[in-house]
């Protein structure tokens, strides 16, 4: 689950160890803070829920792209 | 604070190597990955390549595959870059960055490579 | 490689103009696309990176938009510290790639 640290940090300290179907991903933020212990991606679920994942893994990555093709495609 | 912190300045002669240094501090570069981009003077940035310290998995520029090698060694935190073959077109900035997605937000201060006979 | 051409390649600005710098990918590169700031002799600094992000610290006036192919980075009103040549990159696909940069001189 991502934590708050303050008013305007989000850091993610555990990441999800199994993968997400890419059907259940709404939308992602890129967590680069350098406040942070590492670097992380959130993906927003369908269903509301924030999930910390691992950026270097590559369901992750794939995961990204996807939803990047997708909301673009989806703009007037 | 996040800082990298790159080896000094080095004259080479054309056909020789070099390898550049580059030493985190607050940040633990197994988390990341660290990237190595050129600049040559008055041009713009050219990226050379990556490597995740974690797993030592590189990835490069197909340009530079096989003239450059990435290492790191996370107990001392830092990486690597030896580019061999030099030739006068190498002389540059040489800039070292970390950056799991792509973009890079954290730079070391640049090592100036001149390549002269 | 996706090539990325940015223009122009210089422009001369007043402090307090408005000023845009274009990007344009070779192909669909689906916002992935990061701006940067190099002054003389120093590393270049990381703007804006994705669709809107604007760096920690970057001051508001730095703003990007647009999206597929064609990107913009929009200076609101020119300050004496944003004299400098700026950088668009790629990072939809390795090897990521540089525009050519647009230097902002003084009028």
């Known amino acids: 689950q991502p934590d708050s640290v303050s008013i305007a940090i989000t850091c993610c300290f555990n990441v999800i160890n199994r993968k997400i179907p890419i059907q259940r991903l709404e939308s992602y933020t890129r967590i680069t803070n350098i406040q942070c212990p590492k670097e992380a991606v959130i993906f927003k679920t369908k269903r509301g829920k924030e999930v910390c994942a691992d950026p270097k893994e590559r369901w992750v990555r794939d995961s990204m792209k996807h939803l990047d093709q997708i909301f673009q495609n989806l703009k007037p | 604070q996040v800082q990298l912190v790159q080896s000094g300045a080095e004259v080479k002669k054309p056909g020789s190597s070099v390898k550049v240094s580059c030493k985190a501090s607050?940040?633990?570069?197994?988390?990341?990955?660290m990237h190595w981009v050129r600049q040559a003077p008055g041009q713009g940035l050219e990226w050379m390549g990556r490597?995740?310290?974690?797993?030592?998995?590189?990835k490069f520029d197909p340009k530079f595959q096989g003239r450059v090698t990435i290492t790191a060694d996370t107990s001392t935190s830092t990486a690597y870059m030896e580019l061999s073959s030099l030739r006068s077109e190498d002389t540059a900035v040489y800039y070292c960055?970390?950056?799991?997605?792509?973009?890079?937000?954290?730079w070391g201060q640049g090592t100036t490579v001149t390549v002269s006979s | 490689d996706i090539q990325m051409t940015q223009s122009p390649s210089s422009l001369s600005a007043s402090v307090g103009d408005r000023v845009t710098i274009t990007c344009k990918a070779f192909?669909?590169?689906?916002?992935?696309r990061a701006w940067y700031q190099q002054k003389p002799g120093k590393a270049p600094k990381l703007l804006i990176h994705?669709?809107?992000s604007l760096e920690h610290g970057v001051p508001s006036r730095f703003s990007g938009s647009g999206s597929g192919t064609d990107y913009t980075l929009t200076i609101s009103s020119l300050q004496p510290e944003d004299f400098a040549t700026y950088y668009c990159?790629?990072?939809?696909?390795?090897?990521?790639?540089f525009g050519g940069g647009t230097k902002v001189e003084i009028k």
């Open positions: 994705g669709a809107t």
């Open positions: 990159q790629q990072f939809w696909s390795a090897p990521y790639t």
């Open positions: 490597i995740d310290p974690d797993n030592h998995n590189t």
């Open positions: 192909e669909d590169i689906y916002n992935r």
């Open positions: 960055a970390r950056g799991v997605f792509g973009f890079f937000d954290h």
């Open positions: 607050g940040l633990t570069i197994s988390h990341t990955y």
